[in-house]
């Protein structure tokens, strides 16, 4: 899935905050070194998903998922031919 | 590398007012119930945050998107 | 200082091909996704291409779609149009524009232009 | 596509006037609009982005409003320096569309 493969680490945390888990949450920080103010912000945005239960989770996990497999995303629009696939792996 | 299109999404849930966010939701889809709870999430983070709270947010995005592991 | 500098215009026949050139300095090239827009010979502006960061995006518009080929190069703070099947249409001074915002944004800085004339 | 479209296209105006600009997108833009002024021969030059907010360095007789499909541009007191071209910009999209664009002239 495009998703997985194109920025991991934002997934994780993405997912972490719309399921609710701290715990979660704090291991996917700790791997962008979140300082404690940066950790606390991003707390108050899972509060909210929390305090909105499942539904509101599952909801915006949808539009999450749905922006992340648009044509916008997903290359439609995206030159893709052999030479530029090469080009595009070298600038990384 | 992420999508632009999910970097603006999330910039505007917490830099956005709730029109705009909920207008920029709706582009992508436009169930009632989906744009219903957009709206509740943006307000939640608007009266839960400061304005300090915010820029902590974002800085830890700009870690995400410039992270190895992105 | 910001500063971008395209180069690689010229006059080029109909079918022809030009490759053009923008070297950026003065900012961090990779913070950036970067574009190229044009504008014919007194008329307005048009967005012709715009690629991410680090090229995981890459959008053209369809009036070159199929011809023009976007790419950069980070190493060398680079940006590249090559441009293929040219057509008089295609006349235009092209400037190369860094984005403001993410990958799909209003262009904060410009280069000077580089024209390109597409003649038999 | 979303079209933008300028009126007027030319403005006659002399220095100290109050100039407005109106820019209408063919479907919502949201706030994802910015202003760029022209001289010949010249690069644009970016004066405001998301509708309102003024550019680094650029005077504050420049202000934009607006948002979804309709847009003003203003020039509280024109200067010399502001005879030029305008253009409105949508970024909306990924594939962003210009205005065809505003002259403004001396009267």
């Known amino acids: 899935v495009k998703m997985a493969e194109t920025c991991p680490i934002f997934y994780d945390v993405f997912f972490a905050v719309a399921n609710g888990n701290e715990l979660l949450l704090d291991l996917s920080l700790t791997k962008v070194n979140a300082t404690e103010p940066e950790r606390t912000a991003m707390k108050k945005i899972q509060d909210c998903y929390v305090e909105n239960g499942l539904i509101s989770r599952v909801l915006d996990g949808l539009v999450m998922t749905t922006i992340s497999s648009s044509k916008d995303c997903m290359g439609e629009a995206v030159q893709n031919t052999v030479e530029d696939l090469k080009l595009n792996t070298l600038g990384r | 590398e992420i999508c632009p299109a999910v970097k603006r999404d999330v910039d505007l849930f917490l830099t956005g007012t709730p029109d705009e966010y909920v207008e920029q939701v709706a582009q992508y889809k436009a169930l009632p119930v989906v744009l219903e709870n957009a709206r509740i999430l943006k307000n939640c983070v608007d009266a839960k945050m400061t304005e300090e709270d915010k820029e902590n947010a974002l800085s830890v995005l700009d870690k995400i998107y410039t992270s190895p592991l992105c | 200082e910001v500063q971008l500098v395209e180069s690689g215009g010229g006059l080029v026949r109909p079918g022809g091909s030009l490759r053009l050139s923008c070297a950026a300095s003065?900012?961090?090239?990779?913070?950036?996704?970067m574009n190229w827009v044009r504008q014919a010979p007194g008329k307005g502006l048009e967005w012709v291409s715009s690629i991410s960061s680090y090229s995981s995006y890459i959008y053209i518009a369809d009036s070159v779609k199929g011809r023009f080929t976007l790419s950069r190069d980070n190493a060398k703070n680079s940006l590249y149009l090559q441009m293929h099947s040219l057509r008089p249409e295609d006349t235009a001074v092209y400037f190369c524009?860094?984005?403001?915002?993410?990958?799909?944004?209003?262009?904060?800085?410009w280069g000077r232009g580089t024209l390109v004339t597409v003649s038999s | 596509d979303i079209q933008m479209t300028q009126s007027p296209s030319t403005l006659s105006a002399s220095v100290g006037d109050r100039v407005t600009i109106t820019c209408r997108a063919s479907q919502s833009v949201i706030s994802w609009l910015a202003w760029y002024q022209q001289k010949p021969g010249k690069a644009p030059k970016l004066l405001i982005h998301r509708a309102s907010s003024l550019e680094s360095g650029v005077p504050s007789r420049f202000s934009g409003s607006g948002s979804g499909t309709e847009f003003t541009l203003t020039i509280s007191g024109l200067q010399p320096d502001d005879f030029a071209t305008y253009y409105c910009?949508?970024?909306?999209?990924?594939?962003?569309?210009f205005g065809q664009g505003t002259k403004v002239e001396v009267k």
């Open positions: 910009q949508q970024y909306n999209t990924y594939f962003p569309t």
């Open positions: 524009a860094r984005e403001g915002y993410s990958a799909y944004s209003y262009f904060d800085f």
């Open positions: 003065g900012f961090t090239f990779t913070s950036y996704a």
